[in-house]
């Protein structure tokens, strides 16, 4: 019982449940691969539990290990569209620090209009994550499908 | 030493750790486009802690953010028969109550027979999930080829 | 306050936390399909924390319930590539004890080049997983292309 | 360190036979694969043909039936024998040496021109 009422009084964010469920805002200009995201509970869904948003783009605040999601849907798409535009990539990763930088998850669409993965990896206080989708095809904005989240999992 | 103890008599429950992984049972009759799900240890790796089953579609137990996950693989497919049937699209989403009618997750099957995704989203005690499948193919019902679930991830 | 010492003072394993995500590290000869994976911190950003490698297969070591995820890319591969090699197939199974045998997890790659997915499966301390890949395509070793991994959810 | 040294490339007909070879020397240990890629003026890099460690091979669509990567019994030398050879073949072909713990080492490149 104590534990009960004690785990009730300490802030969630102590027991380190950082988590975040971003929807697509726009991407950027041409020669700007990353997908810039939004959350909020105005917006619909998604939302920002200890994780920050920075022009776009996903900053983590708390040591650990996540599991990073990721679905992408090309808005106009037909396979015959998405081979004769291949190879369109997304590629989700730590951009920043620098020193940090690394590709994390990657799929191309080949014949396919939607990509989704996970993975668990572990990440930092300050990390950035960018998601770059490289080709000429525009994502969807729809809500149910495109969307990008982290949890955190364990210290 | 104390709150390990404490930890092992609570309850799971009161702990959170709303779970359910479900297999595919039927699917309705010709006007109805959703998946009939089933769940417990009787048939095998499928099972329901918290959530429960209502008509073969998932009822919540307990507010949270969740981590919702679906794979269907179509029955009797090739590359050429999932095109041939274009559009066949399977859409996740709370369809009652009807005043949080939603769709959550959304993905076309194109040339592939199998389509596999996951995201994070908040529901409340009393969420259905339904799980339509429009088209005129049938989904497998082998449990490692089409499956659904659910896990409470915070508050 | 008491109970956020007493969880700094327990050890992480206590608290059930298993998690692993492995890397590829080589397939086996023609008439071997399993993937053979590795971890660890100086391979990069894999790791196991409770889970063990037995000759290259992820054996448990906790009972629980788990988030079982998989992301396989063929290394040299088009559409065109993929179709004329279906079928392709990636099974996640249990694999040993021989009693416990049984197919988790399976995906083909049809057209697509990249298969991903995860499921919830109750797993017992001594199960071995294996990752059958059938099909004469070799995977890719690339880290943000193929990757392997478990989280340990609830008991 | 390990070095890698391409030979074998030149200007060949349309429809001849050319054999690439490629010699590992340094500190050799735990190679996963051997990989033969190839580099086409203005083109990204290509895969071409995979050995791994299990003797299992594989092949970019292009070059199926036409190309075989084999290596000697040390595995310090791979070859690629390139039978049947076309004009967009012509590329600047590189040696790949994959080792277990994830090290890539690479050759300087050997140069294949199919012309008549």
């Known amino acids: 019982q104590r534990f009960a009422q004690a785990q009730q009084q300490l802030p969630l964010e102590s027991l380190g449940w950082d988590v975040a469920e971003l929807q697509l805002n726009h991407t950027g200009p041409q020669q700007d691969p990353r997908l810039y995201w939004q959350g909020g509970p105005a917006l619909g869904r998604s939302f920002l539990h200890g994780p920050e948003l920075d022009k776009g783009q996903l900053r983590i605040h708390r040591d650990g290990i996540y599991m990073v999601h990721i679905q992408v849907t090309l808005a106009i798409c037909s396979s015959t569209t998405a081979s004769r535009h291949h190879p369109t990539t997304l590629a989700v990763g730590i951009c920043s620090p620098a020193s940090r930088s690394i590709s994390l998850l990657r799929l191309s669409f080949h014949q396919g209009c939607t990509i989704a993965s996970q993975r668990l990896t572990p990440l930092a206080r300050g990390d950035t994550l960018c998601t770059n989708l490289t080709g000429t095809l525009l994502p969807s904005r729809n809500t149910d499908e495109t969307f990008f989240g982290v949890q955190w999992v364990r210290p | 030493q104390r709150f390990a103890q404490a930890q092992q008599q609570l309850p799971l429950e009161s702990l959170g750790w709303d779970v359910a992984e479900l297999q595919l049972n039927h699917t309705g009759p010709q006007q109805d486009p959703r998946l009939y799900w089933q769940g417990g240890p009787a048939l095998g790796r499928s099972f329901l802690h918290g959530p429960e089953l209502d008509k073969g579609q998932l009822r919540i137990h307990r507010d949270g953010i969740y981590m919702v996950h679906i794979q269907v693989t179509l029955a009797i497919c090739s590359s050429t028969t999932a095109s041939r049937h274009h559009p066949t699209t399977l859409a996740v989403g709370i369809c009652s109550p009807a005043s949080r009618s939603i769709s959550l997750l959304r993905l076309s099957f194109h040339q592939g027979c199998t389509i596999a995704s996951q995201r994070l989203t908040p529901l409340a005690r009393g969420d259905t999930l339904c799980t339509n499948l429009t088209g005129t193919l049938l989904p497998s019902r082998n449990t490692d080829e089409t499956f659904f679930g659910v896990q409470w991830v915070r508050p | 306050q008491r109970f956020a010492q007493a969880q700094q003072q327990l050890p992480l394993e206590s608290l059930g936390w298993d998690v692993a995500e492995l890397q590829l590290n080589h397939t086996g000869p023609q008439q071997d399909p399993r993937l053979y994976w590795q971890g660890g911190p100086a391979l990069g950003r894999s790791f196991l924390h409770g889970p063990e490698l037995d000759k290259g297969q992820l054996r448990i070591h906790r009972d629980g319930i788990y988030m079982v995820h998989i992301q396989v890319t063929l290394a040299i591969c088009s559409s065109t590539t993929a179709s004329r090699h279906h079928p392709t197939t990636l099974a996640v199974g249990i694999c040993s004890p021989a009693s416990r045998s049984i197919s988790l997890l399976r995906l083909s790659f049809h057209q697509g080049c990249t298969i991903a997915s995860q499921r919830l499966t109750p797993l017992a301390r001594g199960d071995t997983l294996c990752t059958n890949l059938t099909g004469t395509l070799l995977p890719s070793r690339n880290t943000d292309e193929t990757f392997f991994g478990v989280q340990w959810v609830r008991p | 360190q390990v070095q890698l040294q391409e030979s074998g490339g030149g200007l060949v007909q349309p429809g001849g036979s050319l054999r690439l070879s490629c010699v590992a020397s340094g500190s050799i240990f735990s190679i996963a694969r051997m990989n033969w890629y190839r580099q086409a003026p203005g083109k990204q890099r290509e895969l071409v043909a995979i050995l791994n460690r299990a003797g299992r091979t594989d092949y970019a669509d292009s070059v199926k039936g036409r190309f075989t990567i084999s290596s000697d019994n040390a595995k310090t030398t791979v070859y690629l024998q390139m039978n049947s050879l076309k004009p967009e073949d012509t590329a600047l072909y590189y040696c790949?040496?994959?080792?277990?713990?994830?090290?890539?080492?690479w050759g300087q490149g050997t140069q294949v021109t199919v012309s008549s």
């Open positions: 790949n040496l994959q080792t277990i713990s994830y090290h890539d080492f």
